[in-house]
Amino acid sequence: IWELKKDVYVVELDWYPDAPGEMVVLTCDTPEEDGITWTLDQSSEVLGSGKTLTIQVKEFGDAGQYTCHKGGEVLSHSLLLLHKKEDGIWSTDILKDQKEPKNKTFLRCEAKNYSGRFTCWWLTTISTDLTFSVKSSRGSSDPQGVTCGAATLSAERVRGDNKEYEYSVECQEDSACPAAEESLPIEVMVDAVHKLKYENYTSSFFIRDIIKPDPPKNLQLKPLKNSRQVEVSWEYPDTWSTPHSYFSLTFCVQVQGKSKREKKDRVFTAKTSATVICRKNASISVRAQDRYYSSSWSEWASVPCSGSGSSRGGSGSGGSGGGGSKLRAVPGGSSPAWTQCQQLSQKLCTLAWSAHPLVGHMDLREEGDEETTNDVPHIQCGDGCDPQGLRDNSQFCLQRIHQGLIFYEKLLGSDIFTGEPSLLPDSPVGQLHASLLGLSQLLQPEGHHWETQQIPSLSPSQPWQRLLLRFKILRSLQAFVAVAARVFAHGAATLSP
């Protein structure tokens, strides 16, 4: 038994036929010693007398609000809730399994940007006697603060004969660092109580993995002279992180009729305009995705092809303009080749995601995972890799990126990747290894030496362990190169001489 909140207790029960249950001792919160009686819920039947009451809790009939009285006066209450465990698994009767992205997904969370603000939601078919309480933190062993509001009913839907209720909650990380590479996941814990049943649900994620931008805004069409083509332009959504030269999006532009089965024109672009072929009765739709990290696509923003007569052309807000000051990257050296670094880091992002397609979909966060990858270098909040830090002095950040590149380059060349099951030299991992080396050499030409981090002695003996470690390293590398790519894209746009 444990206290959920003041005067509310959860009794954990192994739930099987003829289970012995749990013996619970309740103590009346009073200085009084005698003349005390106990009742359950609205019943006036006296269950016992004295300052303590011992009960055997076996089923829901034994749960409820126990009250101690003296001479007709209520002294205190203790509400007992049951948390069922069947075959070693805690019950999940209250919430509906959303089955997306995988089975046993009860909580789903999304973030519109990297500000540390996110929304979680869950589904239930229960309409009454239901309460939720949400707690969250960054990391679990040494938790950092995340503040969540109250869960509210956000939608009601009819599903066949059943009504389905959607509840949602908004949370905000107390000291978020949008530009940093997350190393500890956000933990979300939801306590659900239906009548006398208690259940808890948890979710663990990195903000980067739950990013889903809002749709692009202000779609405009401009027909091109003497052509079937139309120039479509749009802007970054207002809710997306800024500056856009750092937090960049990529877009998918599609022209399609009302039916999904109809023919279509489709093009991907990093710009905020594109030229497509518009057809009568078709619509142009645009959606967005983080340019450097493969999280979710936004919903579509659409405009009909007919009446395509806007006077303005493409109005990109994808850069934040202005050639910044010429900063020294290395003491006594000169600025890095920002554009070359941008191109190579973009290639690294693509390679990191193609190195193992499964990596993007496997849930590799399991017991002890905080320890597994805490040896790898992360681009942290104080490393100067945020837009302001880069403007002030980019060398700190570049040094950190260089250390990380060398680290991962050595890891990808180590036994973890060279051992069984073997990888061929021109596999995506081989290309990734070569590109990491290429970028690190661009950052630190011959003659400059920054100190590099020691490579941990990770040498798993079993091939399956090696495979799992590869996945984890590649997952971590995807996050690292995404931040590096943002740094170089921003540098190329604002710091290039």
């Epitope: 024109d265 990093a270 193609s354």
Partner: antibody
Amino acid sequence: QVQLVQSGAEVKKPGASVKVSCKASGYTFTDYYLHWVRQAPGQGLEWMGWIDPENGDTEYAPKFQGRVTMTTDTSTSTAYMELRSLRSDDTAVYYCNANKELRYFDVWGQGTMVTVSS
Amino acid sequence: EIVMTQSPATLSVSPGERATLSCRASQSISINLHWYQQKPGQAPRLLIYFASQSISGIPARFSGSGSGTEFTLTISSLQSEDFAVYYCQQSNSFPLTFGGGTKVEIK
């Protein structure tokens, strides 16, 4: 299944015109874009243009603008590509292809060899 | 127009080996890049669309990657039926253009 069957080989003199046909089957003709791509002997592929059989809209590669005409006959589910003012360097295999997506080529015809020789 | 350059022009590989074919665009084309295979006397066949998307019916040994200006087609373990010419094609803007092709031949 979706199939494209093209007309037979042609031999033409320089300055003449050629009209290649491409008969579609296995799908609703107006549901796919139709493209024409050619390949000179021992050379690579060269896109010529596309037509939307639903409305007759066309887009031609600048290189062929004014010399090529693409048409369709929805009653027979057939597409046509006419190339005028033929030169010897127009000697090539001409392929039609169809796709629901405008910008790449999924289903290909077997090709029609057009030889331009005096 | 966007110029597509493929390298190498010819690639000699032994059956069972891995083949890596490159395609470079003269300007950034995001992931608007598609790969085709052509055997002698046959029409081309679509292998990969939008840089990395696989086509049903195409063996899993064919995979694509890349974005921007550099793209790669990888054949993980060459089978006898894979010896052919491979073309990349950009769909970023009209006119649609192809690379010059890479011939994969038996070593």
